[in-house]
């Protein structure tokens, strides 16, 4: 006879699954805040910085109340993939000024990657429909100058900070409904 059957697969507790995702998100939020503050100290920002290639912010007035778990996770995953790509780009093409933010930028990239894996796992455990594979994104053009790289860093970290706040708020709100 073959090996004895393994223990029956316990269906995951969605609240516990969400909890560990929220924990990772909050942790990444704190890292991002710290890194953004470090960037502001070294290269003070004047006003808001935007980058056209970044995802538009996920939340608008009233939208949080209507959130559903599949939509939040799918949107969050897509946005974080974009931010991961931007952080990788920043590390590669951001110029010598941004080297002063290492190894923190590398740590941020690794934690972002970990959160994305966690989201993927959560979606499969909750049997949510898996999004189709992402189409290859057009390559990001290198910054036109050292200052362009710094402005891009402000935009990327600022946008990621707000996206993670949206994620924590949305996920905790959804948890109260489970």
């Amino acid at each position: 006879p073959g090996p004895p059957p393994g223990p029956p697969r316990v269906s995951p507790d969605p609240r516990a699954e969400l909890d560990s995702t929220v924990l990772l998100t909050r942790s990444l939020l704190a890292d991002t805040r710290q890194l953004a503050a470090q960037l502001r100290d070294k290269f003070p920002a004047d006003g808001d910085h935007n980058l056209d290639s970044l995802p538009t912010l996920a939340m608008s007035a009233g939208a949080l109340g209507a959130l559903q778990l599949p939509g939040v996770l799918t949107r969050l995953r897509a946005d974080l993939l974009s931010y991961l790509r931007h952080v990788q780009w920043l590390r590669r093409a951001g110029g010598s000024s941004l080297k002063t933010l290492e190894p923190e930028l590398g740590t941020l990239q690794a934690r972002l990657d970990r959160l994305l894996r966690r989201l993927q796992l959560l979606m499969s455990r909750l049997a949510l429909p898996q999004p189709p594979p992402d189409p290859p994104a057009p390559p990001l053009a290198p910054p036109s100058s050292a200052w362009g790289g710094i402005r891009a860093a402000h935009a990327i970290l600022g946008g990621l900070h707000l996206t993670l706040d949206w994620a924590v708020r949305g996920l905790l709100l959804l948890k109260t409904r489970l």
Epitope: L29, M59, L162, L164, R169
Partner: antibody
Framework: EVQLVQSGAEVKKPGASVKISCKAS????????MDWVKQAPGQRLEWIGD????????IYNQKFTGRATLTVDKSASTAYMELSSLRSEDTAVYYC????????????WGQGTTVTVSS | DIVLTQSPASLALSPGERATLSCRAS??????????IHWYQQKPGQAPRLLIY???NLDSGVPARFSGSGSGTDFTLTISSLEEEDFATYYC?????????FGQGTKLEIK
């Protein structure tokens, strides 16, 4: 100096609505959430909800959903809380407070606005 | 919702003494190195003031005689040597889940 300055005391009749303002200064308004907290006489502090000024999305304590409405005017660095269908148990001091993104601790508070609901 | 219970309800001490205030949560508010508990001080007619965030971090401008500790469900605010201006009501608050909730407070009075 980082400051939150709230509008003055209000006396309202049951069934009416009240709208309180909270003007922020001394920091970048969109870098923090704005939270609202109720303190009724002899009761513990109660979180009403919060709003992210950058994106404008409020979330509410279920207890206040449907009666509290949180809004912001980014250009004026001002947050608002409107409470409708007032009843006597809404008599309280209402505070706005600056909330750390994603962590809900409140490091700067307004001076409070007293709302009295009485017929 | 998570319920926070503070003890004692009131405490009478003299300046120079050590004060130990307790806050117990109805379920754990800690997770992987983070404890989502915060402490505030409130004086009559004033707004609350943040003292400690995430269980043990002193907010800027708060004297070093204040400290926070604990994890899981049991947390403590300690004032190592009481000054006149420390006599007030102290609240704990959690932010582990939504909604954040507050304890009922501990009133610290002069003996």
């Amino acid at each position: 100096e980082v400051q939150l300055v709230q509008s003055g005391a209000e006396v309202k009749k049951p069934g009416a609505s009240v709208k309180i303002s909270c003007k922020a200064s001394g920091y970048t308004f969109t870098d923090y959430n704005m939270d609202w907290v109720k303190q009724a006489p002899g009761q513990r502090l109660e979180w009403i909800g919060d709003i992210n000024p950058h994106q404008g999305g409020p979330i509410y304590n279920q207890k206040f959903t449907g009666r509290a409405t949180l809004t912001v005017d980014k250009s004026a660095s001002t947050a608002y809380m409107e409470l409708s269908s007032l009843r006597s148990e809404d008599t309280a001091v209402y505070y706005c407070a600056r909330g750390e993104l994603g962590h809900w601790y409140f490091d700067v508070w307004g001076q409070g606005t007293t709302v009295t609901v009485s017929s | 919702d998570i319920v926070l219970t503070q003890s004692p309800a009131s405490l009478a001490l003299s300046p120079g003494e050590r004060a130990t205030l307790s806050c117990r949560a109805s379920k754990s508010v800690s997770t992987s190195g983070y404890s989502y508990i915060h402490w505030y001080q409130q004086k009559p007619g004033q707004a609350p003031r943040l003292l400690i965030y995430l269980a043990s971090n002193l907010d800027s401008g708060v004297p070093a005689r204040f400290s926070g500790s604990g994890s899981g469900t049991d947390f403590t605010l300690t004032i190592s040597s009481l000054e006149e201006e420390d006599f007030a009501t102290y609240y704990c608050q959690h932010s582990r889940d939504l909604p954040p909730t507050f304890g009922q407070g501990t009133k610290l009075e002069i003996k």
